[in-house]
Interface confidence: medium
């Protein structure tokens, strides 16, 4: 934008100076626009190119034209013009920066009469000594209570002079305050020193709850002592309820170990659960940690007195940004075993995870992994792939966290890392995994199962094999046979029974000679190709008293296929009414090449089984 020819500042005349000021409003962009005006609507300041030539009345300028001004220009204006500008800014609700407010206040040297017409926050920068009479000070401080005191940092001279002046104005002597005094002080009550907190806890603590900034050391100690003393309004911590915790929300960070330990544990847990589910009660929190920490986290200083010396329960009351700023990652790593005992919210666990990620970018050491506890639920499979987990105790500790849930991708990755790290699926590992995930074994491929040593089979329970398919049982059965080979008949059958879905015909024939009384459920899981060659007599011996169950299963494999291969005469000897066998006088010729090649008979497919009616010779009939 081209700058027009400069004109002299005429001070009391005001017009040329004002024109210059208004032009610079936009060109220097020195002010933060009101959120309602520009910040959120995307509006920008209007250019002021024509203002110098035709300076309008200040009050006729639009909010967009009042977005900024430099202090140097204000210093050239008359007090009257400064007041006019201040009033216009208030009317248009233009939000000014601290520097601009300070600048305006400095130029309003005489105490303004029309306090109500000025921007509320401007009053914070006026000298309270200028309003010394009882009426003047009352009017001044009544307005101040509505201003945003936190525009000024605690140490700012303007803020420091307000509290003593306010106390004097309201006639407060000593440190004892009434409810009306606290109300009259407004935001300045947050600056009251610890002695006031100690003597006026009943009326002051509920006000301190909503103070936006952290309390100073002196205030914290006084608040802690008052709360621990168990006086009104909150009573002894041992009697606190969830609603007490809600009411105390802003003071929770100052609670020490003794107080936290004396609150009923169930109350703390219930409150944490509720507040993490429904955070509507919380004060708006500075969004310092960006979502999921995907970008660099803004570094914010830890408030004084909040630096964590150890990982303990007091941290549950820290906001996310305070955890980030006040908890040292190395301290966290050495005291990970304590984290699981503390009811952190998932949001807080995110912060702790981020700290560990920064400390160990290549992956956590196993001494930390073993103590992750619920923080494990925050890990991604990508995080876990960086780990080297070889201790079964570590695996067990992490599986415990996920207990009762389906196997998550995280758990699957963890198990995979563990098994690869150990080099084999040994008995203790299998014992652990199947205890947590009965279906674990059946989730492995036949190739993975081949690395299971026979000794590990002792850890397998029948329910662990419920979801295994025949290909998996084909791999596991020979291992089980080897593992149980030294057991006697009945004990051997009990152990081998759940693996029999992988057994060949010859083993089934051998079992039929041992009076094992196989139940129908086991029989129905046998390989069809292993059952087909069994004779009726062998099946009868194999099933014992359970043979009667064949009738109910005659339409299902492998019973259906087996019946079709048996002579009807033989089936009739069972007395079960099984139908579908080969009638007398029929000859079965199995011409299937497929069975010879693959070992899988295709008895009822198109063509492979040829049933030939043999004509009985007349001479034989004769």
């Amino acid at each position: 934008m081209a700058l027009p020819t400069a004109r002299p500042l005429l001070g009391s005349c005001g017009t040329p100076a004002l024109g210059s000021l208004l032009f610079l409003l936009f060109s220097l962009g020195w002010v933060q626009p009101s959120r309602t005006l520009a910040g959120e609507t995307g509006q920008e300041a209007a250019p002021l190119d024509g203002v110098l030539a035709n300076p309008p009345n200040i009050s006729s300028l639009s909010p967009r034209q009042l977005l900024g001004f430099p202090c140097a220009e204000v210093s050239g204006l008359s007090t009257e013009r400064v007041r006019e500008l201040a009033v216009a800014l208030a009317q248009k609700n233009v939000k000014l920066s601290t520097e601009q407010l300070r600048c305006l206040a400095h130029r309003l040297s005489e105490p303004p009469e029309d306090l109500d017409a000025l921007p509320l926050d401007l009053l914070l920068f006026l000298n309270p000594d200028a309003f010394s009479g009882p009426q003047a000070c009352t009017r001044f401080f009544s307005r101040i209570t509505k201003a945003n005191v936190d525009l000024l940092p605690r140490g700012a001279p303007e803020r420091q002079r307000l509290l003593p002046a306010a106390l004097a104005c309201w006639g407060v002597r000593g440190s004892l305050l009434s409810e009306a005094d606290v109300r009259a002080l407004g935001g300045l009550a947050c600056d009251l020193p610890g002695r006031f907190v100690a003597e006026s806890a009943e009326v002051l603590l509920p006000r301190l709850v909503s103070c936006p900034g952290p309390l100073d050391q002196d205030q914290q100690e006084a608040a802690r002592a008052a709360l621990q003393g168990g006086g009104p309004p909150y009573g002894p911590p041992s009697t606190w309820s969830v609603s007490t915790m809600d009411a105390l929300r802003g003071l929770l960070p100052v609670l020490g170990q003794p107080i936290i330990r004396s609150i009923p544990q169930g109350i703390v847990a219930a409150w944490r659960q509720r507040s993490s589910r429904d955070p509507s009660w919380r004060q708006p929190e500075r969004t310092i940690l960006r979502p999921r920490f995907r970008r660099e986290v803004e570094k914010t200083a830890c408030p004084s007195g909040k630096k964590a010396r150890e990982i303990d329960e007091s941290l549950i009351f820290y906001k996310k940004w305070e955890l980030e700023a006040c908890v040292d990652a190395a301290l966290l790593a050495t005291q990970m075993d304590r984290v699981n005992a503390i009811p952190f919210t998932y949001e807080q666990l995110d912060v702790l995870k981020h700290k560990l990620d920064e400390l160990y970018p290549q992956g956590y050491p196993e001494s930390v992994i073993q103590h992750l506890g619920y923080l494990f639920l925050k890990m991604s499979p990508e995080d876990i792939r960086k780990w080297n987990v070889t201790s079964l105790e570590t695996l067990k500790a992490l599986l415990e966290v996920n207990k009762g849930h389906e196997m998550s991708p995280q758990v699957a990755t963890l198990i995979d890392r563990f098994v690869k790290g150990r080099g084999q699926l040994d008995k203790d590992t299998l014992d652990t995994l199947t205890a947590f995930y009965p279906g674990y074994l059946c989730s492995l491929s036949p190739e993975e199962l081949s690395s299971v040593p026979p000794s590990s089979i002792w850890a397998v329970r029948p329910q662990d094999l419920d979801t295994c398919d025949p290909r998996q049982l084909d791999v596991l059965y020979p291992k089980a046979r080897l593992a149980f080979q030294n057991m006697n008949g009945s004990e051997y059958f009990v152990k081998i029974q759940s693996f029999l879905g992988g057994a060949p015909t010859e083993d089934l024939k051998a079992l039929s000679q041992q009076n094992v009384s196989m139940d129908l459920a086991t029989f129905m899981k046998l390989r069809t190709d292993a059952v087909l060659p069994l004779t009726v007599a062998e099946v009868q011996k194999l099933l014992g008293p359970h043979v009667e169950g064949l009738k109910a299963e005659e339409r299902h494999r492998p019973v259906r296929d087996w019946i079709l291969r048996q002579r009807q005469d033989d089936l009739d000897t069972l007395g079960l009414g099984l139908q579908g066998g080969i009638p007398n006088g029929y000859l079965v010729l199995d011409l299937s090449m497929q069975e010879a090649l693959s070992g899988t008979p295709c008895l009822l497919g198109p063509g492979p089984v040829l049933t030939v009616l043999a004509l009985l010779l007349a001479s034989t009939l004769a």
Partner: nanobody
Framework: QVQLVESGGGLVQPGGSLRLSCAAS????????MGWARQVPGQGLEWVSG???????YYADSVKGRFTISRDNAKNTVYLQMNSLKPEDTAVYYC?????????????????WGQGTQVTVSS
């Protein structure tokens, strides 16, 4: 067959030092965490220290700063250097695979265990 053989125990005066060794065989040593636990007669097992396959370590609070665990993968051996011994360190010390810690159940520890070596601290 996993075998763990401890050595180095004995009688020592308070303030003295001992170095326990545990020779391991029958498994891929470098792939396993190793640890030391101890048992006072009539009491349960207490994990003292552990060293994982990645070399990271932990110690029970009662021995932090006094005991140091280390491993030599080439020799399939894990060591426990015990300094500033106290009478309350008197116990049978066991070498074990799959070290746990105070947060894991000790009544039914996993892994394999050695026969133990007696450490007595007394004046």
């Amino acid at each position: 067959q996993v075998q763990l053989v401890e050595s180095g125990g004995g009688l020592v005066q308070p303030g003295g030092s001992l170095r326990l060794s545990c020779a391991a065989s029958g498994f891929t040593f470098r792939n396993y965490g190793m640890g030391w636990a101890r048992q006072v007669p009539g009491q349960g097992l207490e994990w003292v220290s552990g060293i994982f396959s990645d070399g990271s370590t932990y110690y029970a609070d009662s021995v932090k700063g006094r005991f140091t665990i280390s491993r030599d993968n080439a020799k399939n051996t894990v060591y426990l250097q015990m300094n500033s011994l106290k009478p309350e360190d008197t116990a049978v010390y066991y070498c074990a695979t799959d070290p746990g810690s105070g947060t894991t159940t000790l009544h039914r520890p996993f892994g394999s265990w050695g026969q133990g070596t007696q450490v007595t601290v007394s004046s």
